[in-house]
């Protein structure tokens, strides 16, 4: 039996500089491209090296767009999508989805073709025996004072 | 990941015609940009025509326009090159390449580097 794979979404304003070969990212969806099941929407397919969006640094594939210059990319065709990055002008906003893969259920186990998400028990059985030890080292030292 | 084959190759005479296929496998290939590049000996890489994931918009090489047409058939996961009117200075080993998505940045020209997957190239040479 294969682990629940979750995720934790967050979202992000990411403001770009048009550079000199452009945002510099290629995008996948649209109404009449879904490439992810039941979901129209616009996302990051790759991020051209040395271009604006690289040296930026904090969009990544697999990254939802889900506004462009505070323009809503819901229940747009691929190439009103596309068009609407290209005509942004220089300076472009970016209201973007990041989604980071955790995984949940039985230890050492991945479902097939997934990425190997960080069983979020990994983080935090790690961080609360830091924090009893912690707690374990203050009450020793004010018991010394 | 796709995974290209090109064919159509050969020897042709000046003012012929020949058509390039590049065979596609690999999931989604709707969502792919296709391009043809072309490297004649001693040369870089050059960009030689482009497609979009639909077929709705093509860009090609200043050197190569109103001769060159490039195609796509979705359904048998194919790209064409349709070449006339050969000359001696289109002779090189013609490349297929792909990308994932859409450049979100407007050009006529792309470089090798705009593209992630490539064929292993056919010989077109014009005597």
């Known amino acids: 039996m294969n682990g629940r794979v979750d995720y934790l979404v967050t979202e992000e304003e990411i403001n770009l500089t048009r550079g000199p070969s452009g945002l510099g990212f290629n995008i996948v969806g649209g109404t009449d491209q879904q490439y992810v099941s039941n979901d129209s929407g616009i996302y990051v397919s790759r991020i051209k090296e040395n271009g604006a969006a690289a040296l930026d640094g904090r969009l990544q594939e697999g990254d939802k767009i889900l506004s462009v210059n505070g323009q809503d990319l819901k229940n747009l065709l691929h190439q009103d999508a596309v068009d609407l990055f290209r005509n942004a002008g220089y300076a472009v906003s970016l209201r973007v989805q990041h989604r980071l893969q955790v995984q949940n259920g039985p230890i050492g186990h991945r479902g097939e073709g997934d990425p190997s998400g960080i069983p979020i028990f990994m983080v935090l059985v790690p961080v609360f025996a830091l924090t009893m030890v912690a707690a374990w080292a203050f009450m020793r030292y004010r018991q010394q004072l | 990941d796709v995974q290209l084959v090109e064919s159509g190759g050969g020897l042709v005479q000046a003012g012929g015609s020949l058509r390039l296929s590049c065979a596609a496998s690999g999931r989604a290939f709707n969502t792919y940009t296709m391009g043809w590049f072309r490297q004649a000996p001693g040369l870089e890489r050059d960009f030689v025509a482009e497609i979009s994931w639909s077929g709705g918009s093509t860009g090609y090489a200043d050197s190569v326009k109103g001769r060159f047409t490039i195609s796509r058939d979705n359904a048998k996961n194919t790209v064409y090159l349709q070449m006339n009117s050969l000359k001696p200075q289109d002779t090189a080993v013609y490349y297929c390449?792909?990308?994932?998505?859409?450049?979100?940045?407007?050009?006529?020209?792309?470089?090798?580097?705009?593209?992630?997957?490539w064929g292993q190239g056919t010989q077109v040479t014009v005597s």
């Open positions: 390449a792909a990308v994932i998505g859409s450049p979100t940045d407007y050009s006529d020209y792309r470089s090798s580097l705009d593209y992630d997957y």
